[in-house]
């Protein structure tokens, strides 16, 4: 291909790409027509005054993963068609004023992954079409009032990964088209009443892995369009009654891995489009009534690793649409018949690492298409007859891990589980810890009268004695009390995600793999 | 239909105490908390606290916490409401009340008057 | 403790007349608040339920309304057997708490 230096490979689609730790300058010529440069992984160490002169036609520029720690100035002089620039992964400390001076095309603006310490007002300030800035993975401690004032037009803006501990309340004023703010893993302790008051628009505020203590009550009120906030791994403690009452169109809220103690009445809410709800890893002691009523559409509830002892009958009140329900890992030792009752689709309930002694005979009546119900590890030692009665689509029942007690009353549900044996997954089964001469037999083929003779026993069992049908769907079967899952959680829509190694037989959410991803 | 019937009245004197039963019927007695209320003469409502009869768990007002114990009797479908150290102020109406589709008392019991009199 | 204060204590009333009583929480109480009517000698009867949904058999001349802090229970219309005491009571914290009841009398 005509003009194409010999380090590179040019495409007829205008396109080049310089890769190889043997080039340690641009490479020239250039093709004149060159729409698309790439120059990665290789040894260039600084960018020199107008290397990319003969190719003004220059579209989209990608100087990643190089060695690149300076750049003159003048260095992107003559692009001024130029809409995507990327000088990520580099080793970047400063940015010249005026580098990206006549680049009056530019849309995308990828800086992330350097070692910037600091931006300033006149690094940006002729930038004014660009829609995507990128400044996570760099060192700033500070953004200066003033910094983003020209990019009236930004869409997404990253400074996620960085070392900030404040931020100005001015900073974002004019970013009123800004959709996409990401301020995750930085150090901020409080954000400033006011701080996202221009972001009308904003749809994605990322605040997770900070050490936020405190919100203001009206920070979001503002921030009509937001659909995901993320809140999680911070210090949060408190929530502020209204702090999100203007949020009618937010779809996913974390907030797991935080100090809450209690849920204020009516704080989630009014939120019609809310899907997830992230609160585990938390110290919520206890669930009043109606406490996620305002909740109509919410699909995932997460409530696991938190201390709740005690659920009101009415604390799932209006959750009609909910399909998950993670309780696991908590200190329940009781529930009240009712407190499911208004969960008509719930499909998979985690109660396992739990402290249940029994469950209400008629816990699950209203809940019929449950699929997968965890109680493993809690002090169960028989159920009510007829619990899963009516669950014709229960396809994962996990009860090993109980102290059954295996005497004459444990029959009818020794002869349920031997008829619905697959529910049970293969690779643990409940065993008897009482009688003593039982203890760490299958419950499953333990002869009930050689634990304790003769006691009559009713012929037919009052569990439902439903065959199990080798084609219902079935989720995988991956639990196991030794497993280490490295988890991401929840799944965010960019990669810059929470990895939390847990040792939990299942993952933070108590759900099979199936749905864990 | 949900039935609490409490035990009768009681006269007690001061320092004693008092042992108040409530036999439930017309559900599963041990599947929902069952909670105490009282009621002095010509007063105010005061709740005094729960117990789950499957387990026996309980949940007291600080009020009456050393003074107040909850317990279960699962053969019977009874629970009891005992208090001791017996005062004046505490001549008053009990009632035991199960809650229904969240913490608000839907049944009550009929009441039980303790008098507290030297 | 949350504090419910209700007013007024007492009221007199003729037939046919609108009724409103109010209940105010020391702190938000979301809706969990409940409405009860007591009659002498008798055991107080639920009339409404999260501030503002009717107990089953209740009458729809009784209304609740409120969340928060602010409650109010509304009888459009008194009849003769409405002639009772009203309490309220909150639910979303231990120890639940009552109002110290609002009486309505014959004018």
């Known amino acids: 291909y005509h003009g194409c230096p010999s380090e590179c490979t040019c495409s007829r689609a205008s396109q080049v790409e310089c890769t190889g730790a043997r080039i340690v300058a641009v490479p020239t010529p250039l093709p004149w027509n060159a729409m698309s440069l790439q120059i990665l992984n290789t040894h260039i160490t600084e960018l020199n005054e107008s290397p990319f002169l003969n190719i003004s036609a220059l579209i989209a520029l990608r100087i990643e993963k190089n060695e690149l720690s300076r750049i003159t100035p003048g260095a992107f002089r003559n692009l001024g068609s130029l809409r995507y620039l990327s000088l990520a992964n580099n080793k970047l400390q400063v940015l010249p004023i005026g580098l990206f001076q006549g680049l009056d095309s530019l849309e995308s603006l990828l800086l992330s992954s350097n070692q910037l310490l600091q931006i300033q007002p006149a690094h940006f300030s002729q930038c004014s079409n660009l829609k995507e800035l990128q400044l996570h993975g760099n060192h700033l401690e500070y953004i200066p009032d003033g910094a983003f004032d020209h990019l009236v037009g930004l869409t997404k803006l990253n400074l996620g990964k960085n070392s900030l501990t404040h931020i100005s309340p001015r900073v974002f004023q004019h970013l009123g088209n800004l959709q996409v703010l990401r301020l995750y893993e930085n150090r901020l302790t409080d954000i400033p009443m006011g701080t996202f008051d221009g972001l009308v628009n904003l749809q994605e505020l990322a605040l997770q892995q900070n050490q936020i203590g405190l919100l203001s009550p009206g920070l979001f009120h503002n921030n009509h369009n937001l659909q995901r906030l993320y809140l999680s791994n911070n210090h949060i403690s408190q929530l502020p009654p209204s702090v999100f009452m203007q949020l009618p169109q937010l779809n996913r809220l974390t907030l797991f891995g935080n100090s809450l103690k209690e849920l204020s009445p009516g704080i989630f809410g009014p939120m019609p489009n809310l899907r997830e709800l992230w609160l585990y890893d938390n110290h919520i002691s206890s669930l009043p009534d109606n406490v996620f009523s305002n909740l109509r559409q919410l699909q995932v509830l997460i409530l696991s690793r938190n201390q709740i002892s005690f659920i009101s009958p009415g604390a799932f009140n209006g959750l009609t649409e909910l399909r998950e329900l993670s309780l696991h890992t908590n200190a329940l030792q009781d529930l009240d018949g009712n407190v499911f009752r208004m969960l008509a689709n719930l499909q998979n309930i985690s109660l396992q690492n739990n402290r249940l002694r029994q469950l209400p005979g008629n816990i699950f009546a209203n809940v019929n298409g449950l699929m997968a119900i965890q109680l493993q590890n809690n002090q169960l030692e028989n159920l009510p007859l007829g619990i899963f009665d009516h669950l014709g689509k229960l396809c994962e029942l996990r009860l090993y891990d109980n102290p059954w007690r295996c005497d004459s009353d444990i029959l009818p549900l020794r002869n349920w589980l031997l008829l619905n044996q697959p529910r049970l997954g293969t690779d643990t089964v409940p065993v008897c810890f009482s009688p003593a001469n039982v203890r760490g037999q299958s419950l499953i083929i333990i002869n009930v009268n050689v634990a304790v003779p003769s006691v009559h026993v009713p012929e037919v069992p009052s569990y439902p004695e439903t065959p199990w049908y080798p084609d219902t769907p079935s989720y995988p079967d991956t639990t196991s009390v030794s497993s280490t899952t490295e988890l991401t959680s929840p799944v965010e829509d960019y990669t810059d995600l929470t990895t939390i190694q847990v040792t939990d037989d299942r993952s933070v959410w108590g759900m099979t793999q199936a749905q864990s991803g | 239909q949900v039935q609490l019937v409490q035990s009768g009245a009681e006269v007690k004197k001061p320092g004693a105490s008092v042992k108040v039963s409530c036999k439930a019927s017309?559900?599963?007695?041990?599947?929902?908390?069952i909670n105490w209320v009282r009621q002095a003469p010509g007063q105010g409502l005061e709740w005094m606290g729960w117990?789950?009869?499957?387990?026996?768990?309980?949940k007291y007002n600080e009020k009456f916490k050393g003074r107040v114990t909850m317990t279960r009797d699962t053969s019977t479908s009874t629970v009891y409401m005992e208090l001791s150290s017996l005062r004046s102020e505490d001549t008053a109406v009990y009632y035991c009340?199960?809650?229904?589709?969240?913490?608000?008392?839907?049944?009550w019991g009929q009441g039980t008057l303790v008098t507290v009199s030297s | 403790d949350i504090q419910m204060t209700q007013s007024p204590s007492s009221l007199s009333a003729s037939v046919g007349d609108r009724v409103t009583i109010t209940c105010k929480a020391s702190?938000?109480?979301?809706?969990?608040v409940a409405w009860y009517q007591q009659k002498p000698g008798k055991a107080p009867k639920l009339l409404i339920y999260?501030?503002?949904y009717r107990s089953s058999g209740v009458p729809s001349r009784f209304s609740g309304s409120g969340s928060g802090t602010d409650f109010t229970l509304t009888i459009s219309s008194l009849q003769p057997e409405d002639f009772a005491t009203y309490y309220c009571?909150?639910?979303?914290?231990?120890?639940?708490?009552f109002g110290g009841g609002t009486k309505v009398e014959i004018k």
């Open positions: 117990i789950y009869p499957g387990s026996g768990n309980t």
């Open positions: 702190q938000n109480v979301g809706i969990n």
């Open positions: 999260s501030a503002s």
């Open positions: 017309g559900y599963t007695f041990t599947d929902y908390y």
């Open positions: 009340a199960r809650w229904g589709y969240g913490a608000y008392f839907t049944y």
């Open positions: 009571q909150q639910y979303n914290s231990f120890p639940y708490t």
